[in-house]
């Protein structure tokens, strides 16, 4: 029952606003950027040599045949495989104000199936056996979801959005930087 045939295309997924427990700050002031004396980014920065597409949640379209014992579908079915990594600050506009994005370790998001669809397929069997009809469950879309304390990785296909919980010592609302500075931060994250 391996993957057969080809990859058709890939679609990047943007996480939903509901995935993030904290509201975005208002973009109000123009905080100027200050460049340290020598300028430039440090060498060997984690993301500098990586293709940005490596850090996104993608829907990869695959075509395969459905099998059941010796029987095989008359036609191949196309389904999605969720692939890639999710970085909240990169993928979501205004994520800069959501959560403690400045910390060295942030929320862990995973690219997982979101919705499924049922498709009826006709299976052809060898030896003159009558064709069988089967309903198969196929991935219809993918989503970035945060791992929460209520779920582990074996349950990724089923868990919902993070339950809101009180934050210890909630910090004051940030004085956000300019939209341009914010956009620069959105290019990659965690």
């Amino acid at each position: 029952q391996g993957w057969q045939a080809f990859k058709n295309d890939a679609t990047e997924i943007i996480p939903e606003l509901g995935e993030y427990p904290e509201p975005p700050p208002e973009l109000e002031n123009n905080k100027t950027m200050n460049r340290a004396e020598n300028g430039g980014r440090p060498p060997h920065h984690p993301f500098e040599t990586k293709d940005v597409s490596e850090y996104s949640c993608r829907e990869l379209h695959f075509t395969r045949y459905v099998t059941d014992g010796p029987c095989r579908s008359a036609k191949p079915v196309t389904e999605l495989v969720c692939s890639g990594q999710c970085g909240p600050a990169r993928l979501l506009p205004n994520a800069i104000g959501r959560g403690k994005w400045w910390r060295p370790s942030g929320p862990d998001f995973r690219c997982i199936p979101d919705r499924y669809r049922a498709q009826r397929v006709q299976l052809l069997c060898p030896g003159g056996e009558a064709p069988r009809a089967r309903k198969v469950r196929l991935v219809a879309s993918c989503k970035c979801k945060r791992l929460t304390r209520f779920h582990n990785q074996s349950e990724l296909k089923d868990f919902g959005t993070e339950a809101a919980r009180p934050q210890k010592g909630r910090k004051p609302r940030p004085r956000a930087r300019s939209a341009k500075a914010n956009q620069a931060e959105l290019e990659n994250a965690y």
Epitope: M33, A36, P46, K100, W102, R103, P104, P107, T148, R149
Partner: antibody
Amino acid sequence: EVQLVESGGGLVQPGRSLRLSCAASGFTFEDYALHWVRQAPGKGLEWVSGIGWDRDFIDYADSVKGRFTISRDNAKNSLYLQMNSLRVEDTALYYCAGNKIGYGGLDVWGQGTTVTVSS
Amino acid sequence: QSVLTQPPSASGTPGQRVTISCSGSSSNIGTNTVNWYQQLPGTAPKLLIYSNNQRPSGVPDRFSGSKSGTSASLAISGLQSEDEADYYCAAWDDQLEAYVFGGGTKLTVL
């Protein structure tokens, strides 16, 4: 060249104060969150405090809360740690470290400054 | 005692593969990304792995990280004498509101 250079360490008596400084160069200072991480002699790493681009984004380890204050001066590309009511157990090598805001991992480190608290 | 638990020591011979484990809880590794640091004798720590399994450029692909549930691990394949160092895992802890390190693992290359 990316550099973080700590200074201000030394020998101090319990209950006294000390101020550590960290001078940054070679990168866009405001793009980085900055942290103090300490290492007691022969022991492991302990995160002390961190600050985002300003005082609205600050956290402290429970062991130093109420005694230590972190701050940064973006005009001077400098990070500070004001340490009050010092205890013997604060004796350690104090590192200044940074992570680009929105990115994981402390990818820039200084060489450290030694703080000894002893009577 | 550290919030994240690592074995105090590990060893291997040149060319071998060694794995260092890091065990935490739902409030740290369970919900947040894990970073790994290497500290060579007498030097400052160096970022080795970030965001569970990503290598900064310049770090050899012999080093790899993984995470499952509330545990993480660092694997070093093709062990070399220069890999002899202390290795630390770290993650943000949502309950403590602090960045927590493991106690460190001293790796000896025999």
